[in-house]
Interface confidence: medium
């Protein structure tokens, strides 16, 4: 259970001195920003017990794991329901305070009722100021039932609940007819969910007896022990005024816990501290009885005294909760009720036991089910008490039952059975399962139907290249997700096996069966960027890119060309079948389009990054091409071209465009505007002597248009000079070897 | 060492213009894609515009395309960018970063920023 | 012009818890997807980049994954030093556009 008291100080003549404390002993609590758990909370409940709004009251933190409650100004702020909220996640717990008023007409004789499940509860309400009204009972602020003001009983007018259940717990409240609710009784009952002695789901686990008033935790069987008193069955004593789970905390002030209601997560709830009782908590026990509301009884024996805060001291030679057993006795001490080992493994088992005379090594043995009794193979003396140590032989399956640990002197005996479960470490049945695979990595659900016990603590994926004689990686996984291998080889197979652990020692399983999973072919990670594009034709346009440089075989199977056509809402796909490509001619495009223009890299089926998208608008369609062309060498640097004008032209030409390249060259071409377009011969001056050209050309009216048959022509050796009519027209600038 | 350092940015009226420069150093500048990204006060990352290795290819985002236009001047090593009809949303700190060659797609090279504010 | 969002925008956590940020693209993005932590008044630091590969000289506490349209960012184990603000960027295709960040801080 969360260590969370909440105090309440029941010295009551001035409301103003009376304050609620929230305790956490919790590792972090409360401590907010500054550390690991939420906050604590402590404030009042309206939603039961409402009182009239008055000034609004103050919280302080003194510390990191305690909060103080103050600013009452009159009695009635003080009467209804206040919670504590503390500890973190799952452990978030809380604890409430339920506060009656001293001037009510109706009074609880006890104001916390822990019940276990299917238990009659009775809440007496004891007449304080009579009134002749009936009395109105309500659960949790709603009507419940109604008694005649005479069927009080002796003062004090009875609920019966039989056979409650957990949904019964809550605010019980006993009010006189047409009296303010300021005047009842508030009770709190609070239903254990198992019968007296059980706990966990189903309720089939047994409590360990808890000692001194401890009430059993019905979801997690611990004890949670009065203020007082500590320990896993609280067997023992803190000094006094002492409390929380580890006997942390002190009461505060000159008279200890004396006037302090202390209340504790449930199933405990409220009561005084221990060695008070009474309304108030300002009287001490009676002689004979001590604890928490003085419910324990001493009944001291051989001479043992009450102390009313932890019950009988005993005098030298006697121990026992009465004093009732002699120290000539030896007693085996703390022993665990139950053990857990794993199958094979050869586990230590300890021993402790006191007496008088001492136990020494050879008297203490440990006998296992099957009646086989092992010495202890080392003893270690400390001055109250003896701890034999037992190595005990490999474990099997027929070990499992009762052990028991037994001690002898001449002062007599003394045993304690425990329980030993030999647990199977799991061994996967099946293989891990192949969720998705990328070219680097696997997705992979481990965890697969298995031999032998669980809990399943880890989760070990072993993985290595199929065929390697390599070691095998290893990853240690969470049983509940998915795991992703990664760093993978691209296009590999791998072989993949389960390992499954349990808790403790030896709890590592064999390995599973190997599966072979294998990664993707890998993505094309290099992003082109595109670096040139021009326009070959109306309906044709050569792109260029370039790929980043990087170390490494280039992973690519070819490029794909996404021209997309906004107006139409088309788009044209081109694939480059070669990853060495730079540069490709589109053709058949739709003249007078603009196109958004990317580049990818793919290998297989997957993409790699686009490129930066370009913007090309290709020219509407041009003319017809020119007719008749003819070339005529004048020289060893000039050639003349001749030609006739296009027929059916749409419109005038503008200019017209020659194209000049080496014949067999591996340069771009280059290309002349003759920007007269009247003329029918050009001559192209600056060219290489002895040298072949390729020569065709197009006219240009809003767009180029189609080009014409290419012809042939070679300029003359050096010094040779043509003969024949030359007309000028606008040649080349630069030589094309320039 | 790789360096970025943006200058040009300043405070200016709705509807005028400044150039940002980003002088570069510590790599071969010519090699790598470059981008401008910017960063209103108190407000999130937004990318603006990208221009490949030789300068020969650029991108912007829809909010300044036909305003801000990116350029390069490898010889130089600098990268630039013409802001032109600003308006109020523009201010806002611009830095510029080296693109990634391949592989490790993230901005791992970023200038400290120039301020341009835009305000009458 | 693909679209990325981020949740939650703001969150508090206390050290040592592990805190998740999630990063979602209109569409699918394969892996091209970048973490960068940014403090107040310094430039954007880069952490993840091709959605789950470490950057060098980023502690291990930092881990990315996811592929497609869902992305997460995880810090394992937070420090007070992890108060900063969180984006994420996608490279599948122009625009790189950013999500809007996650604004991380301790309570």
């Known amino acids: 259970a969360v260590d969370l008291t909440l105090l309440a100080n029941l010295r009551l003549t001035d409301p103003q001195r009376f304050f609620l404390t929230c305790v956490s002993g919790e590792a972090g609590a409360g401590r907010g920003s500054d550390a690991w758990g939420p906050p604590l909370l402590l404030e009042k409940d309206d939603r039961i017990v409402r009182t009239p709004p008055g000034p609004p009251l103050r919280l302080a933190r003194n510390g990191s794991h305690q909060v103080t409650l103050r600013g009452f100004s009159k009695p009635s702020d003080l009467v209804g329901v206040f919670s504590c909220v503390g500890g973190a996640g799952a452990r978030r717990t809380r604890v409430i305070y339920v506060h009656n008023s001293p001037g009510a007409h109706l009074l609880p004789d006890k104001v916390t009722h822990t019940v276990n499940k299917g238990d009659t509860a009775v809440l007496s309400a004891r007449v304080h100021k009579e009134k002749q009204t009936d009395v109105i009972w309500k659960s949790n602020g709603s009507y419940f039932y109604t008694l005649d003001w005479h069927e009080a009983q002796d003062g004090r007018f009875l609920l019966q609940l039989p056979n409650v259940q957990p949904p019964s717990s809550g605010i019980y409240s006993a009010t006189y007819l047409e009296a303010s609710p300021l005047g009842s009784a508030f009770f709190r009952l609070i239903v254990r969910g198992c019968g007296a002695g059980r706990w966990g789901p189903g309720c089939t686990k047994e409590c360990p007896g808890c000692l001194h008033g401890g009430v059993c935790h019905d979801h997690d069987g611990e004890c949670v022990c009065p203020p007082g008193f500590t320990g896993t069955r609280c067997e023992q004593a803190c000094r006094e005024g002492r409390f929380g789970q580890s006997c942390q905390e002190q009461c505060p002030g000159i008279s200890g816990c004396r006037g302090l209601t202390f209340c504790l997560p449930d199933p405990y709830g409220c009561s005084c501290g221990s060695g008070w009782r009474g309304s108030q908590c300002q009287e001490a026990c009676a002689p004979g009885h001590f604890g928490a509301d003085c419910r324990l009884q001493c009944q001291c024996q051989n001479g043992g005294t009450c102390d009313r805060f932890s019950g009988c001291v005993c005098p030298s030679g006697w121990h026992g909760v009465h004093c009732e057993k002699s120290d000539r006795i030896p007693q085996i001490l703390n022993m665990a009720s139950e053990l857990e080992f794993n199958l094979e493994t050869m586990p230590r088992i300890n021993c402790a036991a006191a007496g008088n005379p001492f136990p020494v090594r050879g008297s203490i043995e440990l006998r296992k089910p099957d009646g086989t009794v092992l010495l202890s193979t080392k003893a270690i003396v400390e001055p109250e008490k003896t701890t034999a140590e037992f190595e005990v032989p490999r474990l099997v399956l027929a070990d499992s039952g009762f052990w028991e640990c037994r001690v002898s002197t001449s002062g007599g005996q003394d045993s304690r059975r425990f329980k030993v479960n030999v647990k199977v470490p799991p061994v996967p049945l099946a293989a891990p399962r192949l969720l998705t695979k990328q070219s680097r990595q696997l997705v992979v659900s481990p965890l697969v139907s298995f031999s032998g016990d669980g809990p399943i603590s880890t989760v070990r994926l072993h993985y290595r290249p199929q065929d390697s004689t390599m070691d095998w990686s290893t990853i240690v996984v969470d049983p509940s997700e998915n795991v992703t291998l990664m760093n993978l080889r691209p296009k590999t197979g791998y072989s993949v096996r389960v390992q499954l652990s349990r808790p403790g020692e030896g709890g590592e399983g064999a390995w599973g069966p190997p599966t072979l999973m294998t990664t993707d072919c890998p993505e094309p990670l290099l992003q082109p960027w595109l670096e040139g594009w021009h326009v070959e034709g109306t309906d044709r346009l050569r792109v260029s890119w370039s790929l980043p440089l990087v170390p490494g075989p280039l992973v690519g199977d070819g490029f794909l060309l996404r021209l997309w056509d906004g107006t139409r809402g088309q788009e044209r796909r081109e694939n480059v079948s070669s990853p060495q490509a730079r540069t490709a001619l589109l053709t058949g495009l739709t003249p007078g389009t603009h196109y958004q223009l990317d580049v990818q890299l793919y290998h297989c089926t997957l993409l790699g990054p686009a490129s930066p998208p370009a913007h090309v608008l290709l020219p509407p369609s041009g003319p017809p091409a020119p007719r008749h062309l003819h070339a005529q060498a004048l020289s060893d640097s000039e050639i003349q071209l001749t030609w006739k004008h296009p027929e059916a032209l749409p419109g005038p030409i503008s200019k017209y465009v020659v194209e000049v390249q080496v014949a067999g060259g591996a340069g771009d071409p280059l290309w002349i505007d003759v920007d007269r377009p009247e003329e029918t011969s050009t001559i192209i001056r600056g060219l290489n002597a002895s040298t072949r050209y390729l020569f065709r050309m197009r006219a240009s009216i809003q767009g180029l248009g189609d080009w014409s048959n290419t012809v042939e022509e070679s300029t003359l050796g050096n010094g040779l000079q043509a003969e024949g009519p030359v007309q000028e027209s606008r040649a080349a600038e630069e030589g094309l070897d320039q | 060492e790789v360096q970025l350092l943006e200058s040009g940015g300043g405070l200016v009226q709705p509807g005028g213009s400044l150039r940002l420069s980003c002088a570069a150093s510590?790599?071969?500048?010519?090699?790598?894609?470059m981008v401008w990204v910017r960063q209103a006060p108190g407000k999130g990352l937004e990318w603006v515009s990208v221009i490949s290795p030789s300068g020969g290819n650029t991108g912007y985002a829809d909010s300044v395309k036909g305003r801000f236009t990116i350029s390069r001047d490898n010889s130089k090593n600098t990268l630039y960018l013409q802001v032109n009809s600003l308006r109020a949303e523009d201010t806002a700190v611009y830095y510029c970063a080296r693109a990634p060659r391949g592989y490790s797609y993230g901005y791992y090279y970023w200038g400290q920023g120039t301020l341009v504010t835009v305000s009458s | 012009d693909i679209q990325m969002t981020q949740s939650p925008l703001s969150l508090s956590a206390s050290v040592g818890d592990r805190v998740t940020i999630t990063c979602r693209a209109s569409q699918g993005i394969g892996h091209y997807l970048a973490w960068y932590q940014q403090k107040p008044g310094k430039v954007p630091k880069l952490l993840i980049y091709?959605?789950?590969t470490l950057q060098s000289g980023v502690p291990s506490r930092f881990s990315g994954s996811g592929s497609g349209t869902d992305f997460t960012l995880t810090i394992n184990s937070l420090q007070p030093e992890d108060v900063a603000t969180y984006y994420c960027?996608?490279?599948?295709?122009?625009?790189?556009?950013f999500g809007q960040g996650t604004r991380l801080d301790i309570k």
């Open positions: 091709t959605a789950s």
């Open positions: 510590g790599f071969t500048f010519s090699m790598y894609g």
């Open positions: 960027q996608q490279f599948n295709s122009y625009p790189h556009t």
